[in-house]
């Protein structure tokens, strides 16, 4: 015997209170697949999160981060503060990259300059806090 709930499309739930008819998801909820017994609460993009895509009856809301922050984690589960190029985020805030390291993005950590000598090359352009060194031809 086929489960009558399998006929309920996305955007509805199978309503046990009404002989398993398909009822529409309440406002601020959704069901992205058919045959669901309940709808799911829509994600709310509050505080440092902002709404990238509104919730609909068939799909959850999607959030991104307000300016000055960037997304981390699956589905932008967290927002992390941006730093300037040439900096990295520490527990005490944004700190300049130490000598010999660089960061060319507003996120992530400072990475060591390339060691040109490992490839038998010379340094063509010196590195900065914001840019890696440019290796030149072999001396």
């Amino acid at each position: 015997l086929q489960d009558p709930c399998s006929n309920c499309p996305a955007g509805t739930f199978c309503d046990n209170n009404r002989n398993q008819i398909c009822s529409p998801c309440p406002p601020n909820s959704f069901s992205s697949a058919g045959g669901q017994r309940t709808c799911d609460i829509c994600r709310q993009c509050k505080g440092v999160f902002r709404t990238r895509k509104e919730c609909s009856s068939t799909s959850n809301a999607e959030c991104d981060c307000t300016p000055g922050f960037h997304c981390l984690g699956a589905g932008c589960s967290m927002c992390e503060q941006d730093c300037k190029q040439g900096q990295e985020l520490t527990k005490k805030g944004c700190k300049d990259c130490s000598f010999g390291t660089f960061n060319d993005q507003k996120r992530g950590i400072c990475r060591p300059w390339t060691d040109c000598s490992l490839d038998g090359k010379s340094v063509l352009v010196q590195g900065t806090k914001e840019r890696d060194v440019v290796c030149g031809p072999s001396p």
């Epitope: 739930f13 209170n17 009822s23 309440p26 406002p27 601020n28 909820s29 017994r37 309940t38 609460i41």
Partner: nanobody, 122 residues
């Protein structure tokens, strides 16, 4: 036991107005998310309007925005739907509904009343 008793429906001409009432017992309308669903002849249920987030926000279906207003009287434990500029397509049975949030994040709703018939016709 939760009970919802709708009233205020009737026959009205296009462009006319009605106010539906829903007297609730067994729960407090000011402490719950509540609203109105309707069922037009031969069609499924459709959400019309709701008061959400314990009164922090309201929802209206696109088809009724600017024409319908949801409100409640906490002292009378009653929910209202003021309907104006009524159209033939608003003809339906209107049910008061209580949104139910289940453990684990599921959402459904209860309609315990018999509904009230609204017919818009000239």
């Amino acid at each position: 036991e939760v009970q919802l008793l709708e009233s205020g429906g009737g026959l009205v001409q296009p462009g006319g107005s009605l106010r539906l009432s829903c007297a609730a017992s067994g729960f407090t309308v000011s402490a719950e998310d509540v609203g109105w669903v309707r069922q037009a002849p031969g069609k499924g249920l459709e959400w019309v309007s709701a008061i959400l987030d314990k009164g922090g926000s309201t929802y209206y279906a696109e088809s009724v925005k600017g024409r319908f207003t949801i409100s409640r009287d906490n002292a009378k434990n009653t929910l209202y739907l003021q309907m104006s500029s009524l159209r033939a397509e608003d003809t339906a049975v209107y049910y008061c509904a209580r949104i139910v949030y289940h453990a684990g994040g599921g959402v459904t709703f209860d309609t315990r009343g018999q509904g009230t018939q609204v017919t818009v016709s000239s």
